[in-house]
Structure formats: C-alpha cells, structure tokens
C-alpha cells in the first residue's frame, strides 16, 4: 500500500472510559495533528477510516459497525460506543485518506470498571477551590455532545459513596455543584451521574473529579523569608563547615512559579570558585501553601569565604524578596600565656 503519514501512538491521549457507559471519542488527527477540520477534509473528498488492535494482540482489524443496536458507530469524526464493553480496550486508529493522501494516528482506549462507590483505576482531574472564598462551582465534566439540548437529563451528585443532600455548604444545582464556602473537609472525590434517555434506552454517564481546597488569593502575600534573619549570626572558624538555611514561605497562587536561590557576592554559587552545595526540601500546608528550604553548605570554610556576602532570594507571582545572612569569622579566645602576658609587658 502507498505511504501514509503515521503519527504513531498518541499516548498523550490516554483515554479511559467506564464499562457499560456511552463513550464518544473524537479522532485526534483534527485536534492535534492536522491544520484542518473534519468538515474541510470531508468536502475535499477525504474518507475517515477506523480500525483497532485488541489488547495484547498485534493484529489490526476493522471495527465492527454492524453490532446489535448499533453498539459501535461512527458519526463524522466521532467514534461512538453505546455502551462500552470491557473487551473494547485496545489501540484505536483513525486514518484519513484518498487516492493521493493518507494520514493516521493511533490512541489507547481503556475501558475500566468501577465499584458501587465509583472507585476505579480512572485518572481523576483535580479541581482547585479557594478556601473560604465565597460561592464556587464545579461542573460535571465531559458530558457535551452526548444528548441534544432538548433532552433534560437527571443529575445526581455524590461525595465519595454518598449522595449529596442536606450538606450544609454543598448544594447540587443540575450540572453544577455549588460550594457556598469551601473548607479543608470538602477535600475529596465528587461524582456526578448523568442519566438520559435515547431511543427507548437509558444511559448513564459517570464523571468523578477530585476537589482540592487551596489557599485563597485574598490571603496571598509576597514570599516571606524566615531564615536567614537578623537574630542569627553564623560565626565560624576557618576549616569548619558553614551551613546556612534559607527558609521561605510562599502563599498558594494558581499557576505561580515559586523560586528560591542563593547569591554569593552577587553571583550564582556555580559562578564562584568555591565548593558549595545546595540542598532543597519542600513542604506544603493543607491548602498547598509552600515552604521551601535551601541549605547552603561549604564543607571547609576559608577566612576569605567568611568575608563574602551570602544572600537568599525568593520570587513568586506576588513579588521578589531577598535577605542577607550575617556571616562572621569567630575570634579565637585569647590564650593567657601569650596574648595576655604581652599586655603586661612580658617579652
């Protein structure tokens, strides 16, 4: 057969669907790989062909579109399962071609089972809610296109295993779940079950997402350097190890990059000809505020090193701060016989 542009297996699109539920899967060619959409391709005389490789098999085979009740069908650039079965798991390929053009991509589809409490191997999207921030909503995800707007589905929301009713701060409102005020105790998995009729049959769509309550922008502050500070002096003798911790608190900020770094005499440690190691540890609060500690270490400090300027810097979307450590050379205690005796005129 003639050459075909093969985009390979698109593992970025690790599609997971629940067993015994409808699934609609768009051919990824038009979403990620080609610069034109399905309508343009179709009007140019290109045909979209689907086939698949079963799990643990190498053989590519056509998809059977003649199953009872049209269990698997294709509509434009969408492959439909009404509903899925466990053995639909495999790698699916969509190929766009005519006599002179060919392009194809494969993607993995995994049909997963869930238990009565909606637990499953499904990777869950995470929705972040700001703590004590006023009304915030989550929306039942990925249900568009399953039924026409004329159909009015029923939606039931669950937290974990439990139907949400009479919760004091969480209210189901159709496709939305409203949090009147979010607390840490609202962390957890929330599931919407959408039930709709189609051609005399009833289908269910189950969508679970993880809610994580995070620090509110109302409480966000620029980075706070707790150490070094004015109360601690790093006094060392040459040959001793110098350890200076830089401990910085960062408020949670959506999509902010938190940075901590040291400068020695105004330069990055890598640019200074001394043997410096820097170890970093990070801890998070219950609302994803972050505390970063970078420990600057010089194994055997010299008197030159003890004269240098050591500054800890921190930056987030809220601002940049810096703090110098107070480093001194320890003055040796006087030895009586020599130094003090000299003071009394001894020679």
């Amino acid at each position: 057969s003639e050459r075909c542009d093969d985009w390979g297996l698109d593992t970025m699109r690790q599609i997971q669907v629940f067993e015994d539920e409808p699934a609609r899967i768009k051919c990824p060619l038009f979403e990620h790989f080609l610069k034109f959409n399905y309508s343009t391709a179709h009007s140019a005389g290109l045909t979209l062909i689907w086939y698949w490789t079963r799990q643990d098999r190498d053989l590519e085979e056509p998809i059977n579109f003649r199953l009872p009740e049209n269990r698997i069908s294709k509509e434009k650039d969408v492959l439909w399962f009404r509903p899925t079965l466990l053995n639909d798991t495999g790698n699916y390929t969509c190929m766009l071609r005519n006599t002179t053009y060919c392009s194809k991509v494969a993607f993995p589809l995994e049909v997963v089972q869930k238990d009565s409490c909606f637990n499953s191997p499904m990777k869950l999207p995470v929705h972040k809610l700001y703590i004590e921030y006023g009304i915030q909503r989550i929306t039942c995800p990925n249900v568009d296109g399953y039924f026409p707007s004329s159909v009015k589905p029923t939606i039931t929301w669950y937290m974990g295993c439990y139907k949400i009713q009479n919760f004091n701060n969480v209210i189901p409102e159709g496709m939305n779940l409203s949090f009147l005020i979010a607390f840490i105790s609202n962390n957890g998995n929330y599931t919407c079950v959408v039930t709709y009729p189609e051609n005399g049959r009833t289908f269910h769509l189950t969508r679970t997402l993880t809610v994580k309550v995070v620090g509110s922008p109302k409480n966000a502050v620029p980075p706070v350097i707790h150490s070094p500070n004015d109360h601690v002096v790093y006094e060392k003798e040459p040959g001793e190890e110098l350890l200076i911790p830089c401990t910085v608190y960062f408020s949670f900020l959506m999509d902010s990059r938190n940075e901590v770094w040291w400068t020695i005499d105004g330069k990055k440690p890598d640019d200074i000809p001394i043997d410096v190691t820097i170890n970093e540890s990070i801890s998070h609060s219950r609302t994803e505020d972050e505390t970063r500690t970078q420990i600057l270490s010089i194994k055997k400090v010299t008197s030159e090193d003890l004269k240098r300027s050591y500054v800890c810097h921190a930056r987030s979307a809220k601002g940049e701060v810096a703090k110098a450590a107070t480093v001194k050379q320890k003055v040796p205690a006087p030895r009586y016989t020599v130094e003090l005796a000299c003071g009394f005129g001894a020679t």
């Epitope: 937290m159 974990g160 009479n166 105790s185 409480n219 707790h226 609060s285 505020d289």
Partner: antibody
Framework: QVQLLQSGAEVKKPGSSVKVSCRAS????????IDWVRQAPGQGLEWMGG????????NSAQNFQDRITITADKSTNTAYMELSSLRSEDTAVYYC????????????WGQGTMVTVSS | EIVLTQSPGTLSLSPGERATLSCRAS???????LAWFQQRPGQAPRLLIY???RRATGIPDRFSGSGSGTDFTLTISRLEPEDFAVYYC?????????FGGGTKVEIK
Amino acid sequence: QVQLLQSGAEVKKPGSSVKVSCRASGGTFSIYAIDWVRQAPGQGLEWMGGIIPISGTENSAQNFQDRITITADKSTNTAYMELSSLRSEDTAVYYCARNGATSDAFDIWGQGTMVTVSS
Amino acid sequence: EIVLTQSPGTLSLSPGERATLSCRASLSVSSNYLAWFQQRPGQAPRLLIYGVSRRATGIPDRFSGSGSGTDFTLTISRLEPEDFAVYYCQQYGSSPLTFGGGTKVEIK
C-alpha cells in the same frame, strides 16, 4: 445542637491498646472532620490526627503514625481512635473535636476520656 | 512542623483589666488558619477565635484576635471573673496541627 459524647475512662497496662469512641448526636456527622487531641496531666494540648468520615480520609501526626488508627462508622455517627503499644507517657485525657461546619477550626469538643496507663 | 510559642506563660491581672496574650509561629501560618481556645480547669477547650480574628458562635465581643504571618494576639478588653483560665493558640493550616504551650490568666 450537635454534641460529641465520648466513652468512659480506661485503665490500661503498658503494651496494650485502647479504643476511645466519640458519638455525634443532634446533627450531620459524616461531612465534617473529627480530630483527636490529647492532654497529659498538667500539660498542654497535642493534636493526634483526624478523619473525614464521608470520604474516609485520615491523617495523623508523625509521632503517632505507627501506633494510631482512626476510623469512623457512619451508620452509628461514631468516630474511633485506637492507640496501641501504650506506655505510661500516654496517660492523658483524650478529646475528640469536630471541624468543618462553620470553619476548619475545632468548634465542638467531646467531654474527654481519661486513659491511665499503669502497671 | 510549625512551632507556636505563647507568652507570657502566666498573666496575673484583676477583673476589669485588659489582657493581651501573644502567640508567635516559627513559620507563616497558612491561610490565616490560627485559632484561640479557652480551657477552664476540668473542662474541654472551647473555641473563642478562628481565622485569626473571627469570633466563634456565642463568644462575647470582649474577646478579639489580630495578627498575621507569624505574630498573633488575643485581647480580652475587660476581664470578667469567668475569663480566668488557660488560653491556647492553634494553627490548623499545616499538618501536623499544632498548639501553643498555653498562657494562664490568673487573678492578681
């Protein structure tokens, strides 16, 4: 009005375990967190850990992690704290406290359960 | 772990006087999640203030909280006889949740 009712005082031998219960009455139980705090005689308060009954999410302080088990029975609105390998330093009043109703602070406390560890 | 240091350890005052209790954190308190509790002898602690400055239900307005970051204060504007007790601060924003060592407010 929500109340937290704890089980009665216990006397235990070193090396044994104790299981303290905390029953909620007069309100929704499972959607709030229940935490456990202890207080040794004449000492301050020490957080041990907590659970959100509805999701089963449990976490505990590092120094108790290998000895503490926190569970909840939603059908009876009861939370439990079991502490194993008891030693004399575990002699304390153990409190359960609810949070997550109007804030994440401990707004309602049980009356406390005295646990004495003595040979 | 965030260490909370309360001062003074003991405060000797007369009824009607103003009490100022301090709580200092070793690191910034996340989401302003700092609370104050009152504990009378033989009783369970009682929530006074949460979120640094918000009074809990039923707490008289002579109790007020303030501060941010690492320094927090509980103020009792006019001490009543029933206010003589031990007061604890607590941060509940970072795990492990931690309490201060307590300040005893006693009658002078």
